[in-house]
Interface confidence: medium
């Protein structure tokens, strides 16, 4: 069975507001849910649509959403159908309307002492409460010969007299909100002695130092008085002008002229007419000083051919509101066509390359004119001037690959090496024109290179293969000075590469031939048993047909490698005594001895009075202290090799002899006693 977990419920709703009728069903099988309004299926619209099983209203409409809604769940397999409870909206709304004359039938029939009834055509649900106004002042019921019927939304004036003349408006409010009359009613009941408006002053906007004119006329029998006031109630007459209104003139017909207007003259001017009887009539008009601010700068724009683009010109703040127009090449743009002005926007449809250039937005009002240029570039797809070519580049020299293209705007060129983007570093440089420079070509630079040239309109790419022409070179270059151990076997390697595999041979620098125990095997010089005579200068020669030959000179030294005759031993010394660390080494050339203590080399010239290194290499430390404890390393070295040996030094407190120990008891460890 289909069960409603949540049913829609009737509810209050506000015109134009969001609402939701909730519906949730549970059923053993799949069901589809739809809604009925007064028995007819509800179609989804942007305003009213199904949201899950519920019905969502983006904006309630009192006409389209009045009626009874029902949620229907249907099992399409079994045909079973269930309907929810009915739900409807109590839609609250309020709509403005005019104030109209209900009685008498026409304005021509209005005479002093007749009854006048006005009706407020503001409607709403729930019925709103009405408030009447004359000349903007609220009217309360039962006051001054008028009655207000809220139910009938009528205002009755009985009898109507000249004092009731004025502009009648109404406002109404309800739970939904409030509204005021869209059109007001001017009641005019003549009393010759009452001042009546003939000409009311209008708000004026003028440029600085220009003149402003306010017209004001009243009529009455006898003629009424007329007075002008400014802002702070300062009267303006031709005899007494306030200091900041020196250039004000009041004409006989009531008009007020202000010349050379300055900012301090801006404000509210009141024209007051007073008849022999009746209230004074106060008319207000404002003098605004025209102003116009600067326009914001445009960023240059890049568009693509064939597209449609818009550039909005934000008009500068100003009074009166500045008018805005676009110009191109000194000509004002039309309001239709392919390139035209729409509102404040410059519209370019189906952009062509010829549309590129400077467009100017102009804004102007009484205060002046402002303009701002926007530079429009029409992007084109790059075209080739010179594609990269398959190239042979020489190792060790700079290599260049061209990628010359042209487009608007100037294209951006990027290079890829083996599909990897090349980022500029010490070896690679991309010139402004797109050419790639490889600063020092290496063998492994022989691969595929691809350049891509792009603008917003599109991109083109091309690739080229680089073959590196290897130079003839030793790989690696032989060490210029090498040592061989006397009476031992030794080898001196020499290898080289080039565009063609080079031939390698050794010879003595003095031109003498190699002895029979020395062989040259594919570039490796082999000494079966090193003799003193093998020392000397040798040359390795690598050569091939296309590249000639290269030579590497090697000085071979024959040496007896270092061995230690005496090595330092683990030593323990009483504090304050002397420590001796012995070290003697032999070899040819005769080795030099250095000591390292506590991880620093002991410089014989900076040892101080407590330490000394003897000619034979031994290290002596007088008056030892606990901080002298540590690992000491004896380093023996000559021009051919280096060897080291180490031993720890322990500094201990001298024990105080106990009674039980005889004077001759030995210490518990090997000691140096001095």
């Amino acid at each position: 069975a289909i069960v409603f977990i949540k049913q829609p419920s009737s509810q209050d709703a506000l015109q134009g507001r969001r609402a939701l009728l909730r519906c949730e069903v549970e059923a053993p099988g799949p069901v589809h849910v739809y809604w009925l309004l007064d028995g007819a299926p509800v179609q989804d619209t942007e305003r009213r649509f199904a949201q899950g099983s519920s019905l969502s209203f983006a904006a309630v409409d009192r006409l389209q959403d009045s009626g009874t809604f029902q949620c229907v769940a249907r099992d399409d397999v079994t045909g079973e159908e269930a309907r929810s409870a009915n739900a409807s909206f109590n839609i609250k709304w309020i709509e403005a309307g005019p104030v109209v004359l209900k009685h008498p039938a026409s304005e021509a029939e209005i005479q002093p002492q007749t009854q006048v009834t006005l009706r407020c055509h503001i409607d709403g649900h729930p019925r709103p409460t009405y408030q009447w106004f004359r000349d903007g002042t609220p009217l309360s019921d039962g006051q001054s010969n008028h009655t207000v019927s809220s139910k009938e939304r009528n205002l009755t004036l009985r009898p109507a007299g000249p004092e009731h003349s004025g502009l009648y408006s109404c406002c109404a409010h309800s739970a939904f909100g409030q509204a005021c009359s869209s059109q007001n009613f001017t009641l005019s009941i003549a009393d010759e002695s009452f001042a009546r408006v003939v000409l009311a002053p209008q708000d004026v906007v003028v440029a600085r130092y220009e003149e402003a004119m306010f017209h004001c006329q009243f009529s009455a029998q006898p003629p009424p008085s007329l007075q002008w006031l400014f802002e702070d109630e300062t009267p303006i007459t031709n005899r007494s002008r306030p200091p900041h209104l020196r250039r004000a003139t009041v004409f006989a017909n009531g008009s007020l002229l202000l010349t050379q207007v300055r900012p301090r003259n801006a404000g509210i001017y009141r024209c007051i007419g007073q008849g022999q009887r009746g209230p004074p009539i106060i008319l207000e008009a404002t003098l605004h000083l025209a102003e116009i601010e600067d326009m914001p700068l445009f960023e240059p724009r890049v568009f693509t051919a064939g597209s449609e683009e818009r550039v909005t010109c934000l008009p500068p703040k100003g009074l009166p509101e500045p008018s805005v127009w676009w110009e191109h090449a000194g000509v004002r743009l039309p309001t239709h066509g392919r390139v035209y002005q729409k509102g404040h926007e410059l519209v370019l449809a189906n952009i062509a390359e010829s549309d590129a250039g400077v467009y100017t937005c102009h804004a102007a009002n009484l205060a002046g004119q402002r303009r701002q240029d926007v530079n429009i570039t029409v992007a084109t797809v790059p075209s080739w001037l010179k594609k990269p070519q398959d190239s042979q580049l020489e190792e060790g020299k700079p290599g260049y690959l061209d990628c010359l293209t042209q487009a608007t705007p100037k294209p951006t060129v990027v290079w890829y090496r083996n599909q990897m983007l090349i980022s500029e570093d010490s070896r690679f440089e991309v010139f402004k024109n797109g050419t790639l420079r490889i600063n020092s070509v290496e063998v492994y630079d022989g691969t595929w290179y691809r350049c891509m040239s792009s603008t917003p309109a599109g991109s083109i790419e091309a690739q080229a293969r680089v073959q590196v022409l290897e130079k003839l070179k030793f790989t690696p270059p032989p060490q210029p000075q090498q040592c061989m151990e006397f009476d031992k076997e030794a080898t001196v390697p020499c290898s080289a590469t080039g565009r063609e595999k080079p031939t390698i041979k050794w010879e003595r620098a003095d031109g003498s031939s190699l002895p029979e125990w020395v062989t040259d095997n594919a570039g490796t010089l082999h000494f079966a048993r090193v003799t003193r005579d093998d020392a000397g200068n040798y040359t390795c020669i690598a050569s091939n047909g296309p590249q000639g030959q290269i030579r590497a000179h090697v000085q071979l030294t024959v040496a007896v490698f270092i061995t230690f005759k005496v090595e330092p031993e683990r030593t323990t010394v009483y504090q304050g005594h002397t420590a001796l660390l012995q070290c003697e080494a032999q070899g040819d050339p005769k080795p030099l001895i250095q000591w390292k203590g506590k991880d620093r080399i002991l410089d014989p010239t900076k040892l101080g009075p407590r330490m000394h290194i003897f000619q034979n290499g031994s290290l002596v430390i007088h008056d030892v202290a606990p901080e002298d404890s540590g690992r000491y390393t004896c380093i023996a070295g000559n021009s051919c090799n280096i060897k080291h040996t180490e031993a720890p030094l322990y500094v201990v407190d001298k024990p105080v002899p106990e009674e039980s120990e005889g004077p001759g008891s030995p210490p518990p460890y090997k000691m140096i006693q001095t």
Epitope: K6, P8, S9, Q11, D12, L14, G16, R17, G177
Partner: antibody, heavy 119, light 107 residues
């Protein structure tokens, strides 16, 4: 994250007006109603009205209709509530709260603004 | 306007026990009821919307039920941090209204 930050505490004299601001961040300001709820000292919560920031259209509680004005400034994602002709019983903490899509419940609240009305 | 009456005004419950708070509407409002928790010096926090729908980030011990005019907020196992005032609110009709609140205390 969604945040509503209100203006600071105010002390006003009877008859004066007060304008409380509520700056929203962390969501699209025009998508959700902003509600105003007040709470007098030691009392419960009272709904004053709401405003649709997209259209600027308010709905007021009838009780406050003659004295309250709700506005928004979309350019700075800020809602305002102005209460005029203040009385001593308007002393309360005034909260702004973001409604759900339909404006019916309030899942995000401002920190509250204490308005004290005293002669 | 729709009047919401909450009962009891104060409720004392032992930690770990169930707390049941009631809210009655003066007319049928369907499921347009929402529950809030308010701790001293803080803004209210939404617990349950539309009578029974949970809110992300709210512990599962808070649940709601009811429709029409009778609504209930249940805290299945009271924790010390649940001490607060709880309000119901209706959105069926303008003006939106709140109940007068139920103060929840630890027994």
């Amino acid at each position: 994250q969604v945040q509503l930050v209100q203006s600071g505490a105010e002390v006003k004299k009877p008859g004066a007006s007060v304008k409380v601001s509520c700056k929203a961040s962390g969501y699209t300001f025009t998508d959700y109603y902003i509600n105003w709820v007040r709470q007098a000292p030691g009392q419960g919560l009272e709904w004053m009205g709401d405003i649709n920031p997209y259209s600027g259209g308010p709905v007021y509680n009838q009780k406050f209709m003659a004295r309250v004005t709700m506005t928004v400034d979309k350019s700075i994602n800020t809602a305002y509530m102005e209460l005029s002709r203040l009385r001593s019983d308007d002393t309360a903490v005034y909260y702004c709260a973001r409604g759900d899509y339909y404006g019916s419940n309030y899942n995000y609240w401002g920190q509250g603004t204490l308005v004290t009305v005293s002669s | 306007e729709i009047v919401l009456t909450q009962s009891p005004a104060t409720l004392s419950v032992s930690p770990g026990e169930r707390a049941t708070l009631s809210c009655r509407a003066s007319q049928n409002i369907g499921t347009s009821i929402h529950w809030y928790q308010q701790k001293p010096g803080q803004a209210p926090r939404l617990l349950i919307k539309f009578a029974s729908e949970s809110i992300s980030g709210i512990p599962a011990r808070f649940s709601g039920s009811g429709s029409g005019t009778e609504f209930t907020l249940t805290i299945s196992s009271l924790q010390s941090e649940d001490i607060a005032v709880y309000y119901c609110q209706q959105s069926n009709n303008w003006p939106y209204t709140f109940g007068q609140g139920t103060k929840l205390e630890i027994k």
